[in-house]
């Protein structure tokens, strides 16, 4: 090797300077006793290289480049061989900035999975590889004082989100929480969220269906519908609040919500719709009167209002 | 501190029937599912029966369903269990127990003796 | 109905040893396992819910693990309070399931 960069830093700031030394050794004989020392960025050749021979016989070339505002971009030093350019050595510069505090970070208790999924927004393109990390401990207060460190969540690459496991989790005691995000130009972190799992429990859906028609009961009038749920078997013991919404299967017509229904209902007459008409129906829990999540909207029911029933007039004698 | 407090247990005849009682203090009974929860002697733990917050949702083990009916009085902080049709295998201690959220019984009654027995 | 199984359903260990009880259930239940202790004559104790979660005034020398269809109980060191009999129970549906025990006797 004849030439050797050396550079202040390999990253740094976009836009900010920087400062880079070429040397040839003495011994490249081959080589003009004399050579010029040339500076290429990407494919630009870069003027203002002030150049000087040490006491070692080396040849130095140094160079400050003002703003480094490519993300990415190979310096190379060179010389002139014949017609042609000989590359002496090349070094990748990037350029980016460091890392925003992440930000919107929320965690939801999901049972059927039994771990606590958080995710957050990473903020602006740094133009770096950035990591980042969910960090939490599990604390006996108000996240004051920590407790026992849990092993740190790193999400898949590309992705702002992470699952803690049901192993590492208390039920029932309050953990901190906090992303922090890490890049060659520096750490952010995330502001602290101290929360108990169960205090942000996403539970499952019901299943919805229409009521078995008793023998004995009286059959639905025009235009209701008589409905039930099964609660998901697993948060039966959860106190919940549920809620319905529905809209008729044509037109444009947007959802009406009914609620809110205690999940202990089980079954509901629902009225006041149209007669004769095709209905979409879902239905939602939400722990409650404790803090959780809405479930997400069960999968649909199809159900058909009856007609309306024929008018009869009738005649009163008083007597 | 909380506390449950079973009564109602006795000798009874088969066919016969009993009401057990649980008086629960210490917590706010309303918020909380309820459950009786058996043992034969010298046997294990069966699950009887559950009851909701409001006590609109009832399930039982089908050992008993048709003969015992779960209910609650919110107002005064009792659980209750109805047994009819006793036979001799009803016979245990009854424990009535707070159901935990995610469906785990905690804390327990001292426990009442049902004897079926002619 | 969701079957539970303990074993062994006794053994016989010594003050200071690690015993381990194992819970299998007949059809997954994800971590809806919880762990009693009975002592004769005494209503049950809970000591782990939801498979890991070490109950308020548990001694940590009790823990909790598995997930799915198999769980143990582990005491890292026994302690003479510690003869009684575990049973394991699943809420993951109706009927809650109890496993038939497991006896820890004095060697």
């Known amino acids: 090797e004849c030439g050797h960069i050396s550079v202040s830093a390999p990253i740094v700031h976009l836009g900010d300077p920087i400062t880079a030394s070429c040397i040839i050794k003495q011994n490249c004989s081959h080589l003009d006793p004399e050579p010029q020392i040339l500076w290429r960025l990407g494919a630009e050749l870069q003027p203002g290289g002030r150049q000087q021979r040490l006491s070692d016989g080396t040849q130095e070339s140094i160079i400050t480049l003002p703003h480094l505002n490519h993300t990415q971009a190979f310096l190379s030093c060179a010389l002139n061989w014949g017609n042609s350019l000989q590359i002496l050595d090349q070094v990748e510069l990037r350029a980016g900035y460091p890392p925003a505090i992440p930000h919107n970070l929320s965690c939801l208790m999901n049972l059927a999975t039994s771990s606590l999924i958080c995710q957050w927004e990473p903020g602006p393109e740094t133009h770096l590889p950035t990591s980042f990390t969910l960090k939490s401990f599990k604390s006996r207060g108000n996240c004051q004082t920590q407790g026992d460190s849990i092993l740190d969540c790193v999400p898949k690459d590309g992705q702002s989100h992470c699952s803690i496991p049901r192993k590492h989790l208390l039920l029932y005691q309050n953990m901190g929480i906090w992303v922090q995000a890490e890049n060659a130009l520096g750490t952010s972190m995330s502001p602290q969220l101290c929360l108990d799992p169960m205090d942000v429990v996403k539970l499952e859906p019901p299943m919805l269906r229409t009521m078995d028609p008793s023998p004995e009961a009286a059959p639905p009038q025009a235009g209701c519908l008589q409905l039930s749920w099964e609660p998901w078997q697993p948060g039966l013991h959860i106190n919940q609040k549920c809620e319905l919404r529905h809209k008729p299967q044509r037109g444009e017509a947007s959802w009406a919500l009914v609620g809110p229904l205690p999940l202990e209902a089980l079954q509901y007459e629902l009225c006041g719709l149209l007669p004769a008409t095709a209905y979409t129906l879902q239905i939602r829990c939400i722990r409650w009167p404790l803090p959780g999540h809405w479930s997400d909207w069960s999968p649909s029911l199809e159900l058909r209002t009856t007609e309306r029933a024929p008018t009869h007039h009738h005649h009163h004698h008083h007597h | 501190e909380v506390q449950l407090l079973e009564s109602g247990g006795g000798l009874v005849q088969p066919g016969g029937s009993l009401r057990l009682s649980c008086a629960a203090s210490?917590?706010?009974?309303?918020?909380?599912?309820m459950g009786w929860v058996r043992q034969a002697p010298g046997k294990g733990l069966e699950w009887v029966s559950s009851?909701?917050?409001?006590?609109?949702?009832?399930p039982y083990a089908d050992s008993v369903k048709g003969r015992f009916t779960i209910s609650r009085d919110n107002s005064k902080n009792t659980l209750y269990l109805q047994m009819n049709s006793l036979r001799a295998e009803d016979t245990a201690v009854y424990y009535c127990?707070?159901?935990?959220?995610?469906?785990?019984?905690?804390?327990w009654g001292q426990g009442t003796l049902v004897t079926v027995s002619s | 109905d969701i079957q539970m199984t303990q074993s062994p359903s006794s053994l016989s260990a010594s003050v200071g040893d690690r015993v381990t009880i194992t819970c299998r259930a007949s059809q997954g239940i994800s971590s809806y396992l919880n762990w009693y202790q009975q002592k004769p004559g005494k209503a049950p104790k809970l000591l782990i819910y939801?498979?890991?979660n070490l109950q308020n005034g548990v001694p940590s020398r009790f823990s909790g693990s598995g997930s799915g269809t198999d769980f143990t109980l582990t005491i890292s060191s026994l302690q003479p309070e510690d003869f009684a009999t575990y049973y394991c129970?699943?809420?993951?549906?109706?009927?809650?399931?109890f496993g038939g025990g497991t006896k820890v006797e004095i060697k």
């Open positions: 939801y498979a890991s």
């Open positions: 129970q699943q809420s993951y549906s109706t009927p809650l399931t």
């Open positions: 210490g917590f706010t009974f309303s918020l909380y599912w």
């Open positions: 009851i909701s917050s409001s006590g609109g949702v009832t």
């Open positions: 127990a707070k159901l935990g959220e995610l469906g785990w019984f905690d804390p």
